[in-house]
């Protein structure tokens, strides 16, 4: 049976390999039944997740799911790290899995590593 609880469907252990200077949209898939919940993004700093207050966000609606999007325009080197979205629903806080951005700084990278390289050898990003 379909639950009417809010669900945040960021993939577990997900990663995105992106270039500094490019635009990027980080999506938080949100499933809800009636009223759209209030959703926020935060960036992990150790064990705490620091709320991203002044960042551009938007909603995108699809047939069975909605997306709360965090916009990077453009991606900066210090956007590297792990992010999480969370929703307030009936006075409960629901947190997503974290998703990790691996940012390559084009100025310092002589050549762009492949997706497979970046997934298996993230230290390449810090050469």
């Amino acid at each position: 049976k379909e639950s009417c609880d809010v669900q945040l469907y960021i993939k577990r252990q997900s990663e995105h390999s992106i270039l500094a200077g490019d635009p990027f949209e980080l999506e938080c898939p949100v499933k809800y039944c009636a009223n759209r919940p209030h959703v926020t993004w935060c960036k992990l700093n150790g064990t705490t997740c620091v709320k991203l207050e002044d960042r551009q966000t938007s909603w995108k609606e699809e047939k069975n799911i909605s997306f709360f999007i965090l916009h990077f325009e453009p991606v900066l080197p210090n956007d590297n790290g792990s992010y999480r979205c969370s929703a307030n629903f009936q006075s409960n806080l629901i947190e997503s899995h974290s998703t990790t951005l691996y940012v390559t700084d084009v100025k310092s990278a002589s050549e762009r590593p492949s997706k497979d390289e970046m997934a298996s050898r993230p230290w390449l990003l810090y050469r």
Epitope: K11, Q13, S14, N64, A119
Partner: antibody, heavy 119, light 112 residues
């Protein structure tokens, strides 16, 4: 309902490559992971790796890194596994597995594809 | 890699009797998100595997409630309260906490 339909059986010679396909339906392919698991005759299950169809990001068991390549085509909702430099030990049934919204919990299994490597 | 060790590797059970399979991992499967990514799969002869239990103890829909899962950290158990003829096959534990994900070697269940 979720369905994973895999390509037909393959017979290959040692040193050759094989490319297997897995067509998904009944769910949003981009919102999940596609995993590949294999099973040699009379043996146990072995996880090969997984791909995120939304961005092509892959994770492999180091045992298969460099010889296995997973790709995904979101236009056709199809995941692919290519295995190169085949040897007799690669004879196995290869399963495509999907999970619910990227939970990495191996929810749904395809019917499997038998790959036979023989000279 | 995390090694998953199942015992016994085979068991023969009389219908209506209970059965128990143990699975031990070489390190704790408790993830940083507070969940333990330990599943049990059943593979009947000639069929694809199917998931019975996920996150240690959650029963998949359509799975009879005679199946149950328990455990924490490194020690996990699959129990069948009353074995039936349709339960024959091989049972695998699996961990999804650490890459690479790994399976136990399997336990073959036969009916006496």
């Amino acid at each position: 309902q979720v369905q994973l339909v895999q390509s037909g059986a393959e017979v290959k010679k040692p040193g050759a490559s094989v490319k297997l396909s897995c067509k998904a339906s009944g769910y949003n392919f981009k919102h999940t992971y596609a995993h590949w698991v294999r099973q040699a005759p009379g043996q146990g299950l072995e996880w090969i790796g997984r791909i995120d169809p939304a961005n092509g990001n892959t994770k492999y068991d180091p045992k298969f890194q460099g010889r296995a390549t997973m790709t995904a085509d979101t236009a056709s909702n199809t995941a692919y596994l290519e295995l190169s430099s085949l040897r007799s030990e690669d004879t196995a049934v290869y399963y495509c597995v999907a999970d619910h919204y990227g939970s990495s919990l191996l929810d749904y299994w395809g019917q499997g594809t038998l790959v036979t490597v023989s000279s | 890699d995390v090694v998953m060790t199942q015992t016994p590797l085979s068991l023969s059970v009389t219908p209506g009797q209970p059965a128990s399979i143990s699975c031990k991992s070489s390190q704790s499967l408790l993830d940083s998100d507070g969940k333990t990514y330990l599943n049990w799969f059943q593979q009947r002869p000639g069929q694809s595997p199917r998931r019975l239990i996920y996150l240690v103890s959650k029963l998949d829909s359509g799975v009879p409630d005679r199946f149950s899962g328990s455990g924490s950290g490194t020690d996990f158990t699959l129990k069948i309260s009353r074995v039936e003829a349709e339960d024959v096959g091989v049972y695998y534990c699996w961990q999804g906490t650490y890459f690479p994900y790994t399976f136990g070697q399997g336990t073959k269940l036969e009916i006496k």
